[in-house]
């Protein structure tokens, strides 16, 4: 019997509005009261086993005690009524939960979508945390037909799709329901027709097929989504070369209805291209499709668009009558290529003589030729046709080249090394442009660069090394032959010296001393040396420095002490910084020549 | 030379079935997309069906959407037009055409002979 | 779907005039438009694609304008072996391809 509550709470499940005011009250039942002689005075109220203020009880009557709270802030609160019983022991009597929350917003932002081939799916926005099981429910209905409630699952409260077949050019409305303990509210109505909320497929077996007679133009094929037999599609078609990241799209007015083909035009020759395309609603009421997978095709060759880079260098050891010619080329960029290249055709045309062909693989010919004035040409063959002729004037072995371009310099810039100049009066057909390392342990092989006539300023396309000297020399090239070159020394980036200068006495006097040092090797400078600083002193006294243009390779120290040891090293300097040399030693004599103490 | 040679036309009754043929020759068949065209007699020309180059898309004209199917074989330079419940309007030369395209147009050329179909009630 | 209609259906002229059938598109088809000839028992042969591109091996008195929903074939000169019927075909939209119902060029 005494397994019995001893009382009851009431409520005996609230659920109350989040920082609104509550009252609970306790009613104890008339055994319990005789069995522990109590009453009503005797309750203790407490939530979550911590008591609360007598100032919050009101005590009814004999049997009841009643507990307010004001601004209820807890989602959880366990409260129970306890009464004190002999030697001030607690016995519990009832115990309840308040849940506390909040009642629903009006639902916002109600919107549907109708996913090919799938039924029609509506979310919303839920509004504010309720704390409390707040159930969804979307409602649908023709004029003339109610439809089965949707019930939002508890997992996607804010999200449902109806059970029943998606029928278009019928409106619909549509509304949501949101109810829970604290109340229940409709969110606005909307009305539609179905077909204006259409996601389509994405098209699909794109393909891609290119044209042998265009080379500038690729034609996409696919496959409609079923959709297109409901409503008008109009297009997103997007394309990119093979190794770009950001994609180029077709003016939509041109994809703004139904097809299942494009012709896509002004694109580069022997160029792989990826296309996607995705669709939607012509009138734009819907939503697009997803993309398409993506297709790619390799527009066709066309003739090479540029004569290659053409240029010659003669062996200075030549026999009587004879002079070897190296002719050189480079190879063109893809984007002038514009194909595989198969062969170049070289042709020599000795003055006012015969023709001499070659037909070679690789980017340069090695010829014996007579002393005499030549015309070569060059020309670049692909599977589809020859470039223009590069034409080079080989002149006679007596010519004696002039015109040099003028106020020649070279300057590091954005990480690569410009060469500027003024150019000369002359009508110049282009510029070569020769860039060697000039090194003390190998000879300076040479790259190049052609550079049209009317250029002058560029950049060296080679890949060149930090902390290297580099001799660059630019020779304008006339119709009738070289000019003269003119050469400049310039570094990509200067480093201080990876040595400092070895210093040696050459001459030693009582209160002088003459120093002498080598210049330093070209690889060990990192950059064009500026001056030197001579740092001398004695064991005892203070260091002295002195700055030594960078011309000199000796210097005279004097007011020297006599009959002194010295300490010398000396430090050569770029643009970027300097290095110490070896330090050296040597010592003044006590008398001056001829001199007797 | 460029050529396309249509074979398989006939007379079949209504409701029944037949499949013609296209062997095209003189050029790189599996970069072209094809089409067949048909012509009642004393008509004019009306589209029938199309397919990419590499087969992966097909079209139909909704006069024979459901009842006809075009394929290819690249590998034996072979175009297809497989007809079933064949109708009495269904009559016609079927013509195998090579679908050729530039950036501003898509242009049917060469043409084959044609076969005729004749479709008895 | 695009309809094509040609105007005339029919025509009779003589050898040496000049002769002009015009094609028009139920929407715009920019430049997507081709003609072609067809004479009895033949199969359609291309003229002129893309409009106005004369296809190689037509001779140069044919020629093609237009452009939108507008379209004209003109033979400058009409010679013997050009009595045929000619249709103008639509491959802006597609499918499904149109071809115009076709105009009957016979000798006056």
């Known amino acids: 019997e005494l397994l019995d509550p001893c009382g009851y709470i009431s409520p005996e499940s609230p659920v109350v509005q989040l920082h609104s005011n509550f009252t609970a009250v306790c009613v104890l039942k008339e055994k319990c009261m005789d069995y522990f002689h109590v009453n009503a005075n005797y309750i203790v109220w407490k939530t979550n086993h911590f008591t609360i203020p007598k100032e919050q009880y009101t005590i009814i009557n004999r049997t009841a005690s009643s507990v307010t709270f004001t601004d209820i802030a807890s989602l959880n609160i366990q409260l129970t009524c306890n009464i004190l019983t002999f030697g001030q022991l607690e016995q519990n009597v009832y115990g309840i939960t308040i849940i506390s929350g909040l009642p629903p917003e009006k639902p916002k932002n109600l919107s549907c979508i109708v996913n090919e081939g799938k039924k029609m799916r509506c979310e919303w926005d839920g509004g504010r945390e309720t704390h409390l099981e707040t159930n969804f429910t979307l409602k649908s209905e023709w004029a003339t037909h109610k439809f089965a409630d949707c019930k939002a699952k508890r997992d996607t409260p804010t999200s449902c799709t109806v059970d029943y077949s998606t029928v278009y050019f019928v409106n619909i409305e549509v509304w949501v329901e949101a109810e829970n303990a604290l109340g229940k509210v409709t969110s606005d109505h909307i009305n539609f027709d179905p077909v204006y909320k259409v996601k389509p497929n994405p098209p699909h077996n794109l393909s891609v097929i290119n044209s042998e007679e265009l080379s500038s133009i690729l034609k996409l094929t696919w496959t409609n989504p079923s959709i297109k037999s409901v409503i008008i599609l109009k297009y997103n078609i997007q394309y990119r070369t093979k190794d770009a990241s950001t994609w180029s799209q077709i003016p939509p007015e041109d994809t703004a209805s139904t097809r299942s083909s494009f012709t896509v035009q002004d694109l580069k020759p022997f160029t792989e291209y990826v296309f996607r395309i995705r669709c939607m609603k012509e009138d734009g009421k819907g939503y697009w499709s997803d993309w398409s997978e993506e297709a790619s095709g390799i527009t066709y060759e066309d003739r090479p668009s540029k004569a290659p880079s053409f240029w010659y260098k003669i062996d200075p050891s030549h026999t009587q009558g004879y002079r070897t010619v190296q002719l050189v080329w480079k190879t063109l960029p893809p984007f002038e290529a514009n194909g595989k290249i198969l062969d170049y055709e070289v042709t020599l045309t000795r003055w006012k003589s015969h023709l001499q062909n070659y037909t070679v693989n690789a980017t340069k010919l090695t010829v014996n030729l007579t002393n005499d004035r030549y015309l070569a040409t060059l020309t670049v063959r692909n599977l589809v046709g020859k470039s223009d002729a590069a034409v080079l004037t080989i002149p006679a072995c007596d010519f004696q080249a002039t015109h040099p371009v003028m106020d020649l310099k070279a300057f590091p810039k954005d990480n690569m090394l410009w060469v500027e100049w003024t150019t000369p009066r002359e009508s110049v057909k282009k510029y070569i442009l020769e860039w060697c390392v000039l090194s003390d342990k190998a000879p300076c092989i040479t790259d190049w660069q052609q550079e049209d006539g009317t250029v002058h300023r560029t950049y060296l396309r080679g890949n060149l090394a930090e902390s290297k000297c580099y001799l660059i020399t630019v020779t304008p090239v006339y119709a009738d032959g070289p000019g003269s070159p003119e050469s400049i020394k310039a570094y990509l980036k200067q480093a201080p010296p990876s040595k400092g200068p070895t210093v040696r006495t050459k001459k030693v006097g009582k209160n002088e001393a003459v120093l002498e040092w080598d210049q330093l090797p070209v690889d060990v400078q990192n950059g064009f040396i500026r001056n030197y600083t001579i740092f001398y002193r004695t064991i005892i006294g203070n260091e002295t420095a002195v700055n030594v243009d960078s011309s000199h390779t000796e210097y005279t120290l004097s007011s020297l002490t006599s009959d002194t040891l010295y300490m010398v090293r000396m430090a050569a300097y770029t643009d970027e910084g300097g290095k110490d040399g070896p330090e050296f030693t040597f010592t003044t004599p006590k008398f001056a020549q001829g001199e007797i103490e | 030379e460029v050529q396309l040679v249509e074979s398989g036309g006939g007379l079949v009754q209504s409701g029944g079935s037949l499949r013609l043929s296209c062997a095209a020759s003189?050029?790189?068949?599996?970069?072209?997309?094809m089409n067949w065209v048909r012509q009642a007699p004393g008509k004019g020309l009306e589209w029938v069906a199309y397919?990419?180059?590499?087969?992966?898309?097909?079209d139909y004209s909704d006069s024979v959407k459901g009842r006809f199917t075009i394929s290819r074989d690249n590998a034996k330079n072979s175009l297809y037009l497989q007809m079933s419940s064949l109708r009495v309007e269904d009559t016609a030369v079927y013509y195998c055409v090579r679908e050729k395209f530039s950036g501003t147009s898509d242009w049917f050329d060469p043409w084959g002979q044609g076969t005729l179909v004749t479709v008895s009630s | 779907d695009i309809q094509m209609t040609q105007s005339p259906s029919s025509l009779s002229a003589s050898v040496g005039d000049r002769v002009t059938i015009t094609c028009r598109a139920s929407q715009s088809i920019s430049s997507y438009l081709n003609w072609y000839q067809q004479k009895p028992g033949k199969a359609p042969k291309l003229l002129i694609y893309?409009?106005?591109s004369l296809q190689s091996g037509v001779p140069s008195r044919f020629s093609g304008s237009g452009s939108g929903t507008d379209f004209t074939l003109t033979i400058s000169s009409l010679q013997p072996e050009d009595f045929a019927t000619y249709y103008c075909q639509q491959s802006y939209s597609t499918p499904p391809i149109t071809f115009g119902q076709g105009t009957r060029l016979e000798i006056k």
């Open positions: 893309a409009a106005s």
């Open positions: 397919i990419s180059n590499t087969g992966t898309t097909r």
């Open positions: 003189g050029f790189t068949f599996s970069r072209y997309e």
